[in-house]
Structures are given as structure tokens and as C-alpha cells.
Amino acid sequence: AVNGTSQFTCFYNSRANISCVWSQDGALQDTSCQVHAWPDRRRWNQTCELLPVSQASWACNLILGAPDSQKLTTVDIVTLRVLCREGVRWRVMAIQDFKPFENLRLMAPISLQVVHVETHRCNISWEISQASHYFERHLEFEARTLSPGHTWEEAPLLTLKQKQEWICLETLTPDTQYEFQVRVKPLQGEFTTWSPWSQPLAFRTKPAALGKDT
């Protein structure tokens, strides 16, 4: 066997994208590698070129169609192969039977906006992007708020165990700058994981009225 360790991990965004990461200890950075996707019940097949993302890690996106098109279903199986060029031939490095709806990672939520802000609370809404209609309401969210003097890692996680695309943050400090992020996860899928965090939304609470208790 090839020396060292390797890992091949892919996720489906529930619509028309399979994102893959392949890593192998000791592989050369300029190695030319691809991911090939062969569905068991579709007429198409797809290839993407793995591009380096770190010292021994490569990534690529299999674009299956228009961003909001439903290209795969719960019954689909896609055989994914990593192939790397060795001289004049391609060598198979890894193969995975991929069940798209068992390996979900949605796109980060988008369109975060402040609906209403007061001295001690703020109502924020967002939208999910490129999420399959198959989920109906079977989604959950995690949110976090960055307070002054803290890091994102220190921020407590707020869990929304239902498809609720808004949150009312309470017990905030008046006239204070905050940032807010949210991520989403379908309830379906053995290997399903959280989406990336959304772009942070910056907001500021209103100052306390002069001469009043705060």
C-alpha cells in the first residue's frame, strides 16, 4: 500500500453540488488529481480537479447543475473516485459509495439582517440557501453572538431545534457593538454535518435613555 494515511470525505449540499476533500500524507503538492462521480441511476457523470488547500490536502466541487436544481434524491448512490496522475496513467487512490442524503452539509445561511434592535435585545432574521424542498421543516440551527472582548470560540451556542429563520437576542448591553452568526443542519443523514457559519452580521444596540434606569 501507499505509505502514510489518506482521507476522502464528500458532502452534498442537497441540491446540485458535491464538495470533496482528499488528503494524503507525503503526497506531492503538485500532484494532479481528480474526483470522478458516477451515479447509479443517472445519465450524467461529472469530474472536478482537486486543487491544493493545504500542505497535504486537496478540494474540489462537483457542480451537477444549476444551483437550485434538485439533481439527486434519497435513493441515489454516487460512486466517487479519486484518481491521481502517475506518469502517463491515472491511478485510483480512493473509492466511495456515496449516499447523498446521508452525507449532507448545506450552504451557510445568507441574507442576515436586523429586523429590530433595542437597548437590550435584537431581532435578527436570515434565509437558507440552496436547500432541498425534501427537508420540508426538518432543519435545525445554531447561532452565536460575539460580545466585546471575547472570541467566537468563547461564544455560547444557541440551539434552534426547528426550522426557525429568526432569533430574538436578549439581555444585551446598551450601546454595544455585537456580531452574530448562524449555521444550519438537516436532521437527516448518518454523516450529515453543520453548514459553515454564515458571514457575521454586525449590529449595535441602542443607547440607554438618559436619566432612566438600565
Epitope: G4, F8, Q24, R91, D97
Partner: nanobody
Framework: EVQLVESGGGLVQAGDSLRISCAAS????????MGWFRQAPGKETEFVAG????????HYADSVKGRFTISRDNAKNTMHLQMNNLKPEDTALYYC??????????????WGQGTQVTVAS
């Protein structure tokens, strides 16, 4: 508990055939690719063959292609390696392994204890 148990190894003559098997616990067998590796004395562990769990897609090392056939019996949670036209250089301890992927690196998640195959010239 995850268990992979190999069987069927033995001593054969060059040119003979042998079938080795691997029995796996049900959860592993139905959710993981299965494969065979081998290690000859003083040599590194070498990928031999692998088979995926849903489509039974197979992959072979160049050294055994056309001579060895990997298969799986889903009803019995068992994988087989049919080895034909055996050569002395096939002599090794053969290990059964399971992982989410077929990988040519020897870092699969689960391993058996091995079964010895010896090919005499």
C-alpha cells in the same frame, strides 16, 4: 463490538487456487467498504483488493489484477477473495479490513487478525 475474522488460508502449490473469506459484524458489513491487504515477511503492508458496500464496485492492485476476484455475500455478512494462478510472491499474511472508503493506504478503520497464505514453488 466490531469483529473481522479471516479464514481459508493455507499452503498451496504455484498455479493452484485458494479462496479466503472474512466474516464481519452486520453493522460494519452493511455500511463499509471491505478490502484485503497482505504483508509478506520483511515487507510493507500492501493493498490487494477492495469492494464497496452499496454498488459492489471493485478495485485491484496491478499485481493481482486478472488473477484475484473479490466478492461479498450480503446475506451472510461475508467477503471472499478468490485467488487463482497463485505465485510464490503471493505468499503473505492476508488481512481483511473495513472502512468508509476503499483506500490504497493501509489506514483503514477496522482490521482482522490475518490468515496465512503460503505458495510453494
Amino acid at each position: 463490538e466490531v469483529q473481522l475474522v479471516e479464514s481459508g488460508g493455507g499452503l498451496v502449490q504455484a498455479g493452484d487456487s485458494l479462496r479466503i473469506s472474512c466474516a464481519a459484524s452486520g453493522r460494519i458489513f452493511s455500511n463499509y467498504a471491505m478490502g484485503w491487504f497482505r504483508q509478506a515477511p520483511g515487507k510493507e503492508t500492501e493493498f490487494v483488493a477492495g469492494i464497496t458496500h452499496l454498488t459492489s464496485t471493485t478495485h485491484y492492485a496491478d499485481s493481482v489484477k486478472g488473477r484475484f476476484t473479490i466478492s461479498r455475500d450480503n446475506a451472510k455478512n461475508t467477503m471472499h477473495l478468490q485467488m487463482n494462478n497463485l505465485k510464490p510472491e503471493d505468499t503473505a499474511l492476508y488481512y481483511c479490513a473495513a472502512d468508509r472508503n476503499i483506500k490504497i493506504t493501509a489506514d483503514w478503520s477496522y482490521w482482522g487478525q490475518g490468515t496465512q497464505v503460503t505458495v510453494a514453488s
